[in-house]
Amino acid sequence: SGVFQLQLQEFINERGVLASGRPCEPGCRTFFRVCLKHFQAVVSPGPCTFGTVSTPVLGTNSFAVRDDSSGGGRNPLQLPFNFTWPGTFSLIIEAWHAPGDDLRPEALPPDALISKIAIQGSLAVGQNWLLDEQTSTLTRLRYSYRVICSDNYYGDNCSRLCKKRNDHFGHYVCQPDGNLSCLPGWTGEYCQQPICLSGCHEQNGYCSKPAECLCRPGWQGRLCNECIPHNGCRHGTCSTPWQCTCDEGWGGLFCDQDLNYCTHHSPCKNGATCSNSGQRSYTCTCRPGYTGVDCELELSECDSNPCRNGGSCKDQEDGYHCLCPPGYYGLHCEHSTLSCADSPCFNGGSCRERNQGANYACECPPNFTGSNCEKKVDRCTSNPCANGGQCLNRGPSRMCRCRPGFTGTYCELHVSDCARNPCAHGGTCHDLENGLMCTCPAGFSGRRCEVRTSIDACASSPCFNRATCYTDLSTDTFVCNCPYGFVGSRCEFPVGLPPSFPW
C-alpha cells in the first residue's frame, strides 16, 4: 500500500491556445486530468489501472502551481494504491480548458484539450522527487513525482506491513525495510522476550520484564547463582540445591553436630592443650601447676609435700621453697647433718646407722613415711583411682575425680555411653569396652546413624532433557533444574520458538 504523488509546478501556454490551435476565449482556464497505469512500452488509451485524479482550474494560460499540500492536499496530487508497487508505471497528464464550471469529461467538448503528455519508466519507492519537463509545440509542463509507502507500510515495494507497538505482544519500532527494531531491554523475533538483568544465570534465572532476575526453585541471590541449601542446614553449604555440605568441624544431616568443640568453644583454661574426642567431647592436657577437667584449678606445688625430713613448704610465684628443720639441708631438706644419736626418727620410727655413723635411715611404722617418718602416708600414692581417675588428697581422706564416662568412689563404674541416646534416627545403641556402636535403621548410616541414605528420589531419573536432579532430603522429593530451552516440573516441555514472519 502506498501513494504515487505528482507535484505540478508550472504550465506555460503563452499564446493561450488549445491543442487544435484555436485560441481560448477569453483565456485558457486550465485544469488537469492524471491517469496512472501499469507499464506500457507504448502508452495507449485504456483503463487507468493504478488510479486517476483531476484538479480544479489551477490558472489561466501560463501559471505556476502553488504547493497546497497543507490546505487540502490538492498539490501534490495523490494517487493511492493498495497493492505491491511493481517498480514501473505509465503516466498520462492532460491539460484541459474549462469554459464553464462543470469539469466532468462528458460536460466538455472534445476539442477542449490543451495538451497531453505520456511517459513511462521505472520508479523505486523513496522520498526523493524526480523532476521532469515535457514540451510540445505550444505548451510546456514542469512537474515532479515520487512513490512513497502508506503509513505502516515498508520495503522496496511497500508490501511489508509493520506497526510499532509496545505491549506484551511486542516492544518494537519499524525499520525502513519493515523489519522490527526491538526497544531497549527486549529481544526475540517479535521483541516480546525481556533481556534479563546482566549476569542473571541462564538456567537458574528468568525474567518477565527487562533487567529483572527471578530465580527458579532451589536458587537464590541477585543473579540466581547461589544454591539454596537443605532446609535446616546450620553449619553447611551447597554447590547444588538442597545440599548440606558441612563446614570443617561440623557433622550430621544438618551440619549441627559439633565435631570441633575445642575450636568452637575453647574450653581448656590456663594455656592447657585441647583435644577433640568425639561429638561435644574433649580432653584438656594441663600445664604444670593446674588441674581439673578444664585445667581450671590452680595446683599448689606444695600439695605434693616435696620437703623431706619435716621441712615446711612455702609456695612462691616461680615454684616453692623448703624451710628445713635443724640438722637438714638441701632443696628438699634431703641432706642430714644428724645421726641416730640425735633421735631423728619421728612417730616411733627406728633409727639405723649407716656409713659408720656418718648417716642413718629411719624404719617407719605403718601409716608414716618420709626419711624421718615425718609424713603421714599419702593415700593417693597407691593410685587408687581406676580408669584414669585423678586422686585428690582432702585432709585425712582422699577423693577420685573421674574421667567422662566413669563414676563411683574409685571411678570403677563405667557410665553407659548409650545413656545419652547418641544414635540418631532411631538407631540401636550397644555399649562396648572402648565406647559404643550404633545399629542404624534402613535408610540411615554413619557412626551415629546421622547420614540419611533414604530412597533417592532421583534414582528413577525423573528429569527429562538432560536436566539435573536434586533430592530434597527433608521430603524425599526431587527438584529438576532445567537446561536452557526447557521448562516444567520434569523439564519435559520445550520452550517453543516462534515461527518466522508470514510476510
Epitope: 503509513d151 505502516n152 506491513l161 506497526k163 510499532k164 507497538r165 509496545n166 505491549d167 506484551h168 505482544f169 511486542g170 526475540g188 523475533e189 517479535y190 516480546q192 522476550q193 528468568y206 525474567c207 518477565s208 520484564k209 521448562v487 516444567g488 516441555f493 520445550p494 520452550v495 517453543g496 520458538l497 516462534p498 515461527p499 514472519f501 508470514p502
Partner: antibody, heavy 121, light 104 residues
C-alpha cells in the same frame, strides 16, 4: 492438534469466588509464542477480554476487572486458571479460554468450547 | 478506556459483498483481528493483523485498516457466513472487542 478445555463449577453464589481451569492438550503451554487468555460473554451480549498470562507467569488484566481477577499458570499440569472474586449476577456469562498468538499480533487463533457460569444464590 | 464501535447489523443478499466497519481512535495504527461467532459456538479467528487470513479461512474474507476505521469485507457472501462478527485490537496491554455486528 492443540485443544483447550474449560472446567469448573457452573453455579457460584454471590460474593463468592469463581474458579475456572483451562487444560491445554496436544501441545505445550510452555512456549514464548503464546499468551493464554480468558474472555467472557454474558448471555445475548458481546465478548469481553478478562486477561491473559504467559508460561513464565507474566499477567495482564482488564483494568475494569483488575481488582478482582487472578490468572495463574501451572506448566507441570499444562493448565492455566482464572479466579474472579466477589462475584455478582453481572458476572454470569459463558467463560472462554483462548490462545493468543504472538505471530498473529495477539489474535486468538484457538478457543475452548466455553463454560456457562451462573451467579445466583 | 479505548472503545471500538461496530454497526449492530448488516444485511446482504447471497453472492453480494458485505462490509463491516469497526472504528476507534487512530485504529489504523493498531493491528485489528476479526472473529466470526455462530449461535452456540465459540468465536473463530477469520482475519488477523488487519488483512491476514489464518489457514482454512476462505479467500472471500478480506480486511483493511487505515485512519480510524478497519473494514471486514465478505465477497460473494454465502448463507453459511450468517453470524456475529467482532473486531478486536490491543490498547497498550489490554484486549478490546468491538460491540459486534450481526450479518444476515
Amino acid at each position: 492438534e492443540v485443544q483447550l478445555q474449560e472446567s469448573g463449577p457452573g453455579l457460584v453464589k454471590p460474593s463468592e469466588t469463581l474458579s475456572l481451569t483451562c487444560t491445554v492438550s496436544g501441545g505445550s503451554i510452555s512456549s514464548s509464542s503464546y499468551y493464554w487468555g480468558w474472555i467472557r460473554q454474558p448471555p445475548g451480549k458481546g465478548l469481553e477480554w478478562i486477561g491473559d498470562i504467559n508460561y513464565a507467569g507474566s499477567t495482564y488484566y482488564n483494568p475494569s476487572l483488575k481488582s478482582r481477577v487472578t490468572i495463574s499458570v501451572d506448566t507441570s499440569k499444562n493448565q492455566f486458571s482464572l479466579k474472579l472474586s466477589s462475584v455478582t449476577a453481572a458476572d454470569t456469562a459463558v467463560y472462554y479460554c483462548a490462545r493468543e498468538d504472538v505471530k498473529f499480533g495477539g489474535g486468538a487463533d484457538l478457543w475452548g468450547q466455553g463454560t456457562l457460569v451462573t451467579v445466583s444464590s | 478506556s479505548y472503545e471500538l464501535t461496530q454497526p449492530p447489523s448488516v444485511s446482504v443478499s447471497p453472492g453480494q459483498t458485505a462490509s463491516i466497519t469497526c472504528s476507534g481512535e487512530s485504529l489504523g495504527d493498531k493491528y485489528v483481528s476479526w472473529y466470526q461467532q455462530k449461535p452456540g459456538q465459540s468465536p473463530v479467528l477469520v482475519i488477523y493483523q488487519d488483512a491476514m487470513r489464518p489457514s482454512g479461512i476462505p479467500e472471500r474474507f478480506s480486511g483493511s485498516n487505515s485512519g480510524d476505521t478497519a473494514t471486514l469485507t465478505i465477497s460473494g457472501t454465502q448463507a453459511m457466513d450468517e453470524a456475529d462478527y467482532y473486531c478486536q485490537a490491543w490498547d497498550m496491554e489490554t484486549g478490546v472487542f468491538g460491540s459486534g455486528t450481526k450479518v444476515t
